[in-house]
């Protein structure tokens, strides 16, 4: 999948665009909005009826090197009595993000954009019923 | 920056950290993952904390379309299908990295940008505060 060219007619390619070799693009990895913070309600991963745990994956050849993944704790959801109820199910909610992957080929280094699917948390759903033939 | 293992046979000129600017292949590796959450799952309707998905489009960004979740109710849906306000629907937010055209309108020059998206909602026990 390629990055789409700017296709709108009102976009004129400015003279100030940097020269880029064919088949590649220039990427500045100094992140815009680096210091913005998630403003989620506190400890929702423990207070949810579909609670989850976090695990951190670390890869020094990826930027950012640290990616946090959620894992649902239960198959069912936690009911008002604090017990697991499997008539309802905890399911993962996922979101794509981009990372930069560094590849070593011999002594040369290349960079590749990669889509990563991150599990962000869990939600409680009514399961779909299937009758298997 | 990030320290990386180096092939010991290579010249020592390579920086151990990611450089500030890199040239990357135009092809994005990975996954023809389904970018439309409406198609990929119907959890947004089946959840006890259901949400609506709003399309956020920006041609200066890649991906240009991002779906934002907004919880439908303050409470959660109980077994009878009614909204129960003893529990709360709250958004699950995630910081993601996208590409921002920089300078603006340039076809092949980008900068990474961190944006905060609401991905879905989950049902939580509210924290009870006693205000003096």
């Amino acid at each position: 999948r390629k990055i789409p060219k700017v296709g709108h007619t009102f976009f004129q390619k400015p003279e100030s665009c940097p020269p880029v070799p064919g088949g590649s693009m220039k990427l500045d990895i100094g992140i815009i909005n680096e210091n913005q913070r998630v403003s989620m309600s506190r400890n929702i991963e423990s207070r949810s009826t579909s609670p989850w745990n976090y695990t951190v994956t670390w890869d020094p050849n990826r930027y950012p090197s640290e990616v946090v993944q959620a894992q649902c704790r239960n198959l069912g959801c936690i009911n008002a009595q604090g017990k697991e109820d499997i008539s309802m199910n905890s399911v993962p909610i996922q979101q794509e993000t981009l990372v930069v992957r560094r590849k070593h080929q011999g002594c040369s280094v290349s960079f590749q954009l990669e889509k990563v699917l991150v599990t962000v948390g869990c939600t409680c759903v009514t399961p779909v019923i299937h009758h298997v033939q | 920056g990030i320290t990386i293992p180096r092939n010991p046979g290579c010249p020592n000129s390579e920086d151990k950290n990611f450089p500030r600017t890199v040239m990357v292949n135009l092809n994005i590796h990975n996954r023809n993952t389904n970018t439309n959450p409406k198609r990929s799952s119907d959890y947004y309707n089946r959840s006890t904390s259901p949400w609506n998905l709003h399309r956020n489009e920006d041609p200066e960004r890649y991906p240009s379309v991002i779906w934002e979740a907004k919880c439908r109710h303050l409470g959660c849906i109980n077994a009878d299908g009614n909204v129960d306000y003893h529990m709360n629907s709250v958004p699950i937010q995630q910081e993601i990295l996208v590409l921002r055209r920089e300078p603006p309108h340039c076809p092949n020059s980008f900068r990474l940008e961190k944006i905060l998206v609401s991905v879905g909602c989950t049902c939580v026990t509210p924290i009870v505060h006693h205000v003096a």
Epitope: C72, L75, G76, I86, N89, S90, P127, H130 | -
Partner: nanobody
């Protein structure tokens, strides 16, 4: 696509034993539950026994002490050992397989207990 293969039903005299088995294939998840429900003629389907994540079990009161559920996680299979069978255990027994967000029901295997 999930497949469920049920076996072990049949005709048995009161006081006898049967062993039901059900193997699931196609979609395997870290979190899952497997078990058995039953439906007697003219009655609603009811829980017999389930096992969640290969660990915790849940039995209907009417079968406690007589039926034992077990699981082979490597084969993704569940077994129901039914001892001291009674005529009121006569029913179609349905394999149940639950993975996050989806419940799969087998076609059922007939268990008939004669007095």
């Amino acid at each position: 696509e999930v497949q469920l293969v049920e076996s072990g039903g049949g005709l048995v005299q009161a006081g006898g034993s049967l062993r039901l088995s059900c193997a699931a294939s196609g979609v395997i998840f870290r979190l899952n539950a497997m078990g058995w429900y039953r439906a007697a003629p003219g009655k609603q389907r009811e829980l017999v026994a389930i096992i969640v994540n290969g660990g915790s079990t849940n039995y209907a009161d009417s079968v406690k002490g007589r039926f034992t559920i077990s699981r082979d996680s490597a084969k993704n299979a569940v077994y129901l050992q039914m001892n001291s069978l009674k005529p009121e255990d006569t029913a179609v027994y349905y394999c149940y397989y639950n993975i996050p967000g989806d419940v799969y029901w087998g076609q059922g295997t007939q268990v008939t207990v004669s007095s």
